[in-house]
């Protein structure tokens, strides 16, 4: 996360980190107690190595009473997903066993009502990812809050050009950004999931290039298939 | 299939005024900025102004304000372009065009003549 | 504004040779977020312009691969390596990445 701060912690209970051998790959949200959602293009960044998923943390080193780190016992990717793209770029992971729930764990609601979040509207994103643009990973959950920001001007040539499709959705990143790390964590307007953040090699924190994430809603047939 | 249907050619006299439309077939209205250029007979494009369909604000080139004003009808995915005080100079081909991925998208034009 | 100066004006060639048509800018149409939004369009008679190029270099989709572009900073060209018929029209290079847009004089592309 660029230009935020330290989350309160355990204040989003929700929060995931998706690990490979016990290092921070990228973010997820915990949307039911054996399933964590996350972005696709996670699992290329896996190679072979051993996916595993931390719940209930706030620091990524240090010992805390909620921290338990889970299994997984089937990665989900969306079955439209491609390498070279962000289309579709959502990532199931169900969970070895269902998780212990408590004030530092529980799931997000997520959005079901297919319609575009309100321009202006703040969010907020979550994440380990890098806080500098040298590359410094934080230890603790950093989070921003983020406007949403209108497709269209997402989409002009000097933005994303075209590329932002109707089952995506932007925010601005002027010096505040998600960023290398975050990806696959949550964009949550008004206490409920709306987003997860796309995981290409984007530049952060140019206002030009606004963040990606990936509408839930426009998944919710896909979503509840995979749970169900 | 994407297309911009543009409305049909326009004989106006000079210092009239005069509104061309511009209908979006095809995608979501709202996902893109809608562009305008005008091409005079032999000549090369200029670029008129572009229009936000969400909030509908309008960015212009400093040549064209006070003649263009850009508009849109979210209910009917159409942009409008406004030209007033018209001179011969004013006659042109008027386009609009999509913005994302680039111009990749553009109306078949409309023919403005300016005449008395 | 950016002026976009196009060489030549007019380019004669024959079916299957090769034709190259320059662009060059005033200033520099680097952007602010280090993207060069320099874009080619083709316009035959009649009808509206179609885009070709953009990005300097990326062909849009649908477009030949006997098509590509080159260049940065101000100097650009266009590279068409076997001309066919339907390739006859005029060329019109753009940028964007400036207010405002601006797009070439263009260069008409026909048979000797």
């Known amino acids: 996360i660029l230009g935020g701060r330290e989350a309160e912690a355990h204040a989003r209970p929700y929060m995931a980190s998706v690990q490979v051998n016990g290092e921070h790959l990228c973010g997820g949200v915990l949307v039911a107690e054996q399933w964590v959602l996350s972005a696709a293009h996670c699992l290329e960044d896996a190679a072979d190595g051993k996916v595993q998923v931390l719940l209930g943390a706030h620091s990524l080193s240090q010992p805390e009473p909620s921290k338990r780190l889970y299994d997984v016992l089937r990665a989900v990717p969306h079955p439209d997903s491609r390498p070279d793209t962000i289309d579709h770029d959502l990532l199931l992971l169900q969970l070895s066993e269902k998780a212990t729930l408590g004030p530092a764990v529980r799931p997000l609601p997520w959005q079901r009502v297919d319609r575009d979040v309100e321009p202006g509207t703040l969010c907020d994103v979550a994440g380990w990812g890098i806080v500098s643009h040298a590359g410094r990973r934080p230890d603790r959950l950093q989070h921003v809050l983020l406007p949403v920001l209108d497709r269209a001007t997402c989409n002009r040539r000097t933005h994303h050009d075209g590329a932002i499709t109707q089952r995506m959705m932007c925010a601005e990143s002027n010096r505040r950004d998600s960023c290398k790390g975050d990806s696959g964590g949550p964009l949550v307007c008004g206490g409920v999931l709306e987003g997860v953040v796309t995981s290409g090699s984007r530049v952060c924190g140019n206002r030009k290039k606004p963040g990606i994430y990936t509408r839930v809603a426009s998944y919710a047939a896909w979503i509840d298939s995979v749970l169900a | 299939e994407v297309q911009l249907q543009q409305s049909g050619p326009e004989l106006v006299k000079p210092g009239a005024s005069v509104k061309i439309s511009c209908k979006a077939f095809?995608?979501?209205?709202?996902?893109?900025?809608k562009n305008w250029m005008r091409q005079r007979h032999g000549e090369s494009l200029e670029w008129i102004g572009d229009?936000?369909?969400?909030?509908?604000?309008?960015n212009y080139n400093q040549k064209f304000k006070g003649k263009a004003t850009l508009t849109v009808d979210k209910s009917s995915s159409t942009a409008y372009m406004e030209l007033r005080s018209l001179t011969s100079e004013d006659s042109a081909v008027y386009y609009c065009?999509?913005?994302?991925?680039?111009?990749?998208?553009w109306g078949h034009g409309t023919l403005v003549t300016v005449s008395a | 504004d950016v002026l976009m100066t196009q060489t030549p004006l007019s380019l004669p060639v024959s079916l299957g040779d090769q034709a190259s048509i320059s662009c060059r800018s005033s200033?520099?149409?680097?952007?602010?977020?280090?993207?060069?939004?320099l874009e080619w369009y083709l316009q035959k008679p009649g009808q509206s312009p179609n885009l070709l190029i953009y990005?300097?270099?990326n062909r849009f989709s649908g477009v030949p691969d006997r098509f590509s572009g080159s260049g940065s900073g101000t100097d650009f060209t266009l590279k068409i390596s076997r001309v066919e018929a339907e390739d006859l029209g005029i060329y019109y290079c753009?940028?964007?990445?400036?207010?405002?847009?601006?797009f070439g004089g263009g260069t008409k592309l026909e048979i000797k």
């Open positions: 095809g995608y979501t209205f709202t996902d893109y900025y």
């Open positions: 753009f940028q964007g990445s400036h207010v405002p847009p601006t």
């Open positions: 200033q520099t149409i680097v952007h602010s977020n280090g993207d060069t939004y």
């Open positions: 229009i936000n369909p969400n909030s509908g604000d309008a």
């Open positions: 065009a999509r913005e994302g991925p680039s111009f990749a998208y």
């Open positions: 990005k300097v270099s």
